[in-house]
């Protein structure tokens, strides 16, 4: 906390500018007025400001909304950012999408700090769902946000947005956040044709049931063995040696390598020996 | 359309060797050797699956004949050993692109040769 002192003559801040960094903490408490600093925030990010005086300019904003900043002062917020805590931002009201970019950027090749999360939160909450354009720019700064959402928060993503999912953002997704993003994708994907839905729906496949596997292994999709391994071990169970001969077409060879990793070794101690004879791979039930 | 060339057919002694061919005109990831004796049906007698070289044998030829491929010719070898009489048939190479039925079964393949006649007698 600094000491309410008077500003020293001839040193009252007309403007937000480079002088500025050459004041004592004590100096820039006294000086600078928190509406000329609200009005010109823009400009402190270019001004190389230690960590103290940004304490203080933060302190001034403080003072001036008690109550939580306006989106104008958040969108230029900049490295001050950085200094807020989860307490401050979650009297924010954050609805544009240009300022949650500008404050992601400012934590760009970061791990997602407990500011940023709740950052997210307080937006998506606001919105009410997780729209696509959001979901973009979600996914484009923290490839893992998606996984990062409980089966719950999943539930309010709207089919539509999935368009803007790409495969790396559910690497790690457990079964249950694919159980409710797979029936979105399907819905989604659902007027594309086949090589291009499979294309498409690949990625979500470890929340499809053992029908809809049957159905894709109709359509000479050629599943490779990383998609085949993520499936869930009882969509797989039922599934015959010829339908699964069919769902992996050329990548069947790969089932030897994995003979003794779930899925396949469950699936293939359910099966007939006659069965698992006809793929050529010495497959031992 | 996957056009595929034997060679390597002949007369042999019994217990002799012979080594056939197969040239395919492109990459294919399933390859196998069929035979068909005079009045008798096609039957498997082995299969490779290209990529990884896992390869699976008839009882009736197992540990006599040994399968093998080179993918930077897109050619599959079959050496077979230890020739007995009741090896004579016309060979044929076979190919598939989908996969569908048990690698010996005949109507699993799409694409064949037009075969080399082995022929082992004394």
């Known amino acids: 906390e600094v000491e309410k002192t008077a500003c020293p003559s001839g040193k009252k801040a007309r403007e937000i500018d480079e002088s500025l960094i050459f004041y004592k903490k004590w100096e820039l408490e006294a000086c600078v007025d928190a509406a000329l600093l609200a009005t010109q925030m823009d400009r402190v990010n270019a001004i190389p400001f230690t960590y103290e005086q940004l304490d203080v300019l933060k302190h001034k904003l403080d003072e001036l909304y008690p109550q939580g900043y306006p989106e104008s002062v958040i969108q230029h917020l900049g490295y001050l950012f950085l200094k807020m805590s989860p307490e401050d931002i979650r009297k924010w009201n954050v609805t544009s999408l240009e300022t949650l970019k500008a404050l992601l950027e400012v934590n760009k090749g970061h791990e997602m700090s407990p500011q940023v999360a709740t950052l997210i939160d307080r937006f998506v909450k606001g919105r009410g769902q997780l729209d696509k354009d959001t979901l973009d720019t979600l996914t484009a700064f923290y490839p893992g946000y998606l996984c990062s959402l409980s089966p719950e928060e999943l539930s309010s993503v709207p089919p539509s947005s999935i368009w803007a999912v790409r495969p790396q953002d559910l690497d790690t997704c457990d079964p249950r956040q694919l159980d409710v993003l797979y029936p979105k994708a399907r819905l989604a994907f659902q007027n594309m044709n086949g090589s291009e839905y499979f294309v498409k729906i690949q990625s979500f496949l470890g929340g499809a049931p053992t029908e809809d596997l049957k159905a894709l292994s109709q359509q000479n999709v050629s599943m490779d063995l990383a998609t085949f391994m993520k499936l869930r071990t009882d969509a797989v169970l039922p599934l015959t040696v010829a339908e699964v001969q069919k769902l992996l077409g050329p990548h069947v060879e790969g089932l030897k390598a994995e003979e003794r990793h779930r899925p396949v070794r469950d699936w293939i101690l359910r099966q007939r020996q006659d069965d698992l004879d006809t793929l050529g791979l010495g497959l031992q039930g | 359309e996957v056009q595929l060339v034997e060679s390597g057919g002949g007369l042999v002694q019994p217990g002799g060797s012979l080594r056939l061919s197969c040239a395919a005109s492109?990459?294919?990831?399933?390859m196998g050797w069929f035979r068909q004796a005079p009045g008798k049906g096609r039957e498997g007698v082995a299969h490779i699956y290209t990529r990884g070289g896992t390869t699976v044998y008839a009882d009736s030829v197992k540990g006599r004949f040994v399968l093998s491929r080179d993918n930077s010719k897109n050619t599959m070898y079959l050496q077979m050993n230890s020739l007995r009489a009741e090896d004579t048939a016309m060979y044929y190479c076979?190919?598939?692109?989908?996969?569908?039925?048990?690698?010996?079964?005949?109507?699993?393949?799409?694409?064949w040769g037009q075969g080399t006649l082995v022929t082992v007698s004394s």
């Open positions: 492109e990459f294919t990831y399933s």
């Open positions: 076979a190919a598939r692109t989908i996969f569908e039925g048990s690698w010996s079964s005949p109507s699993s393949f799409d694409f």
